[in-house]
């Protein structure tokens, strides 16, 4: 007795397609071993037609596939364009040879059933309408015209020319003639349902001289389109319902036994399970729209249906489109935190995954807004300037090649709480959703800048200090100058005539940035932050205003010549710690590659460092350095 299970008998008709599901026991070996579909010959040999190793026989070319669903312990063989030659005995099985575990399946493909010779076949989709053409002889022009539906015993009236209408066709059936043509009448039936399928007879006149025509109306449910998506990825349902429903409300629902639960519609309804990760986008005036769901979960798998109706809810007899969504748990998309927590005044660093094969793609970050149909306006991108209201507090750091980019948002307020999406202009499956929660701060921030009201004087030296706690002792500290194109990390060394530097005071764990001399271009936002390798941590921001020295004032330069010499000396110490190897430029520099990671003087273990020059618009540059402070007890 084989542990493989499937349909023992499958029957279909020529031209149709079948989906044969085979079930296998839940073991790791079974999930990963070869799956096959073979045809049994008279000799008892079973000839492979298709296998999960990629083999496809000539007779199945272009019309069959085999898909494994390891999470369901099933695999499915889909065969299209069936002919009577496909009738026969088959096996679905597992194993490296066709003598492994298997199950016998008998497939019978029969001819399309014969209808009376004069039968006209109309094939329509559910929810659509049909116009049945009924020809008659001129002598029956004055006679009654009718359409009836055949039942087992009789023919039940649908509509006739005396305006009699069957109750189940009221408002849906119309009998009419076109122009002056007195040899044909028409019956239009709208909002077709499965119950409308069957044989009809249209008739003009009575008795033996009556004109009759047989009609076979086939009402088809749309075949669900199969969608295979990875866990945590995104899916787009493209719904094309036709111009006749262009002005109706649209919806997407998920089948739940006998009902279809609306997930989203254009009237503002949205299932809370999809909060922050769904958008509905009307495409055009032809009834087309799309629904995008990001951050796919295992429980999102299922049977989906889109449709249109003024109520925004599923209604029988209205056009629909369907999908079967499978969510593969063996995902290529890394498992990241879906909720990030911050505090007011603080900062968050959000790591956004992208397809590592598309390192040159443009990266974006948008904020999901649920009003209306939902939308996600871009706040920042690799080539998109930061939105004005986020000035000085939002930046995107692209780390080419490692499959992650980082978005940092600081000066948080409770208004920042909500859902954000990471997306690129490349592989759309890699759209991910982050929920940002912002709580009221209950303690001082980890990073603090002094002075807090920073006004630098043109031509002088200006120093700001960033205080950090001992827990950031082993992390790299950096200063960067924010612009709406990003936050350019200041290089740790510059021997240009204009000197600026960052130094670290041993006793009080601080990293300082000195602008020397201050120029007008120095005005703007600066961030102090910590990072470990490519992982960014907390940041804090300060705005430095630059003003001219008021004439005649006896302004005292904050750093005298001795202090300036001291800074230079400290820089020399920093420089002496950079080995030849560490001075190599970053390969394949991206927009933020002009970053010199901060040197930690006093560290016993030298970490691998990279450097590069960050030129500002006028060719001047800023520099930053940092030291670890060892406390001896």
């Amino acid at each position: 007795k084989s542990p493989i299970f499937g349909p023992q008998e499958v029957s279909s008709i020529e031209g149709d397609s079948v989906s044969i599901t085979c079930y296998y026991p839940d073991t790791s070996v079974n999930r990963h071993t070869r799956k096959y579909w073979c045809r049994q010959g008279a000799s008892g040999m079973c000839t492979t037609l298709i296998s999960s190793n990629g083999y496809l026989s000539k007779e199945y070319s272009g019309r069959a596939n085999l898909i494994n669903f390891p999470e369901n312990n099933t695999f499915v063989i889909n065969i299209e364009q069936l002919t009577q030659d496909d009738t026969g005995s088959y096996k679905c099985g597992l194993g490296t040879s066709n003598r492994g575990l298997s199950f016998d399946v008998s497939l019978e493909v029969s001819q399309v059933p014969e209808l009376p010779s004069d039968t006209h076949v109309y094939t329509k989709d559910i929810g659509r309408n049909v116009t049945i053409e009924c020809p008659f002889k001129r002598e029956n022009a004055p006679s009654k015209k009718s359409l009836c539906k055949k039942t087992n015993q009789s023919c039940e009236l649908v509509i006739d020319s005396t305006e009699k209408v069957n109750p189940s066709y009221i408002g849906r059936a119309k009998l009419f003639m076109k122009g002056t043509d007195l040899t044909v009448f028409y019956v239009n039936i709208s909002h077709l349902t499965h119950n409308d399928a069957g044989l009809y007879i249209c008739q003009a006149g009575e008795g033996p001289s009556a004109d009759k025509k047989n009609v076979d109306l086939q009402v088809l449910a749309p075949e669900p389109e199969l969608l295979y998506k990875d866990l945590r990825s995104s899916v787009t349902f493209e719904c094309d319902l036709g111009r006749e429903v262009a002005n109706e409300a649209k919806y997407l629902c998920r089948m739940n036994k006998e009902t279809c639960d609306v997930i989203i519609n254009t009237l503002g309804k949205r299932d809370p399970d999809f909060e922050g990760r769904i958008l509905i986008t009307p495409k055009d005036d032809n009834g087309r729209f799309s629904v995008l769901i990001t951050g796919l979960r295992k429980e999102d798998a299922g049977h989906y249906q889109c449709g249109a109706h003024s109520s925004g809810l599923p209604q029988e007899g209205w056009p629909i489109q369907t999908w079967q969504l499978f969510v593969n748990e063996e995902s290529t998309i890394p498992n990241r935190r879906s909720v990030v927590k911050g505090v007011t005044g603080g900062s968050v660093a959000i790591a956004c995954p992208y397809n590592p094969k598309e390192s040159s793609s443009l990266k974006y970050w948008c904020r999901w807004e649920g009003d209306g149909n939902g939308h996600c306006p871009v706040l920042v991108g690799t080539q998109a300037q930061v939105q004005e209201e986020y000035e000085g507090r939002l930046a995107l750091f692209d780390q080419p090649g490692n499959g992650t980019y980082t978005v940092i948002l600081n000066q948080l307020t409770t208004e920042d709480a909500g859902f954000y999406w990471c997306l690129t202009n490349g592989d759309s499956r890699w759209r991910t959703t982050i929920e940002l929660q912002v709580a009221e701060a209950t303690r001082e921030p980890n990073l603090e800048v002094t002075p807090q009201n920073a006004t630098a004087v043109l031509g002088e030296t200006f120093t700001v200090s960033c205080h950090y706690p001992c827990k950031f002792y082993s992390q790299e500290k950096y200063w960067c100058k924010w612009s709406n194109k990003g936050c350019h990390i200041l290089p740790s060394h510059d021997e240009g005539a204009r000197q600026s530097s960052v130094s670290c005071d041993q006793s009080s764990q601080l990293v300082s940035m000195t602008l020397n001399p201050v120029s007008k271009e120095d005005e703007g936002w600066y961030w102090c932050g910590v990072k470990q390798g490519q992982t960014y941590g907390e940041t804090t921001a300060i705005y430095i205003a630059v003003e001219e020295r008021t004439r005649g004032s006896s302004h005292v330069n904050p750093t005298d010549a001795n202090a300036r010499a001291k800074v230079a000396l400290e820089e020399e110490v920093v420089d002496s710690s950079i080995s030849e190897k560490e001075n190599k430029a970053i390969p394949n520099p991206g927009p933020f590659a002009n970053e010199r990671e901060i040197q930690n003087v006093g560290d016993q273990a030298q970490e691998n460092r990279a450097s590069g020059d960050a030129g500002s618009a006028d060719g001047q540059s800023r520099s930053s350095s940092s030291k670890h402070h060892h406390h001896h007890h």
Epitope: F5, P7, E9, S12, Y23, V76, H194
Partner: nanobody, 129 residues
Framework: EVQLVESGGGLVQAGGSLRLSCAAS????????MGWFRQAPGKEREFVAA??????????YYAESVKGRFAISRDNAKTTAYLQMGSLNPEDTALYYC????????????????????WGQGTLVTVSS
């Protein structure tokens, strides 16, 4: 709401045959599944056979223990399923339940009761030796 009513059960001698019917009312399915399960006294409910249809396709599933002896079918009006049982033996004695659903995800094991939403009350089949 769909109602399922089983009929055709009764007492039969070993080696004999019976034909069970399951009539569905309340709604017709353009695609769907109807199955038969059975439960012998003191035992768990077990799968017997199922028939699934969609468009012009029909898929018939059987439990190993009834293969070659039982045959499942349905009428074209899509409202009644039949289970033709032959070569009956005392181990076939049980309460036979009919179950149905609009096409469930065909990636769920149809031998489990879970995919079936609608159930009948059952009809008793007793096979005497």
């Amino acid at each position: 709401e769909v109602q399922l009513v089983e009929s055709g059960g009764g007492l039969v001698q070993a080696g004999g045959s019976l034909r069970l019917s399951c009539a569905a009312s309340g709604r017709t399915f353009s695609s769907g599944i109807m199955g038969w399960f059975r439960q012998a006294p003191g035992k768990e409910r077990e799968f017997v056979a199922a028939i699934e249809w969609s468009g012009g396709n029909t898929y018939k599933y059987y439990a190993e223990s009834v293969k070659g002896r039982f045959a499942i079918s349905r009428d074209n009006a899509k409202t009644t399923a039949y289970l033709q049982m032959g070569s009956l033996n005392p181990e076939d004695t049980a309460l036979y339940y009919c179950a149905a659903d609009e096409s469930p995800s065909r990636y769920i094991d149809l031998r489990r009761p879970a995919p079936y939403h609608y159930w009948g009350q059952g009809t008793l089949v007793t096979v005497s030796s």
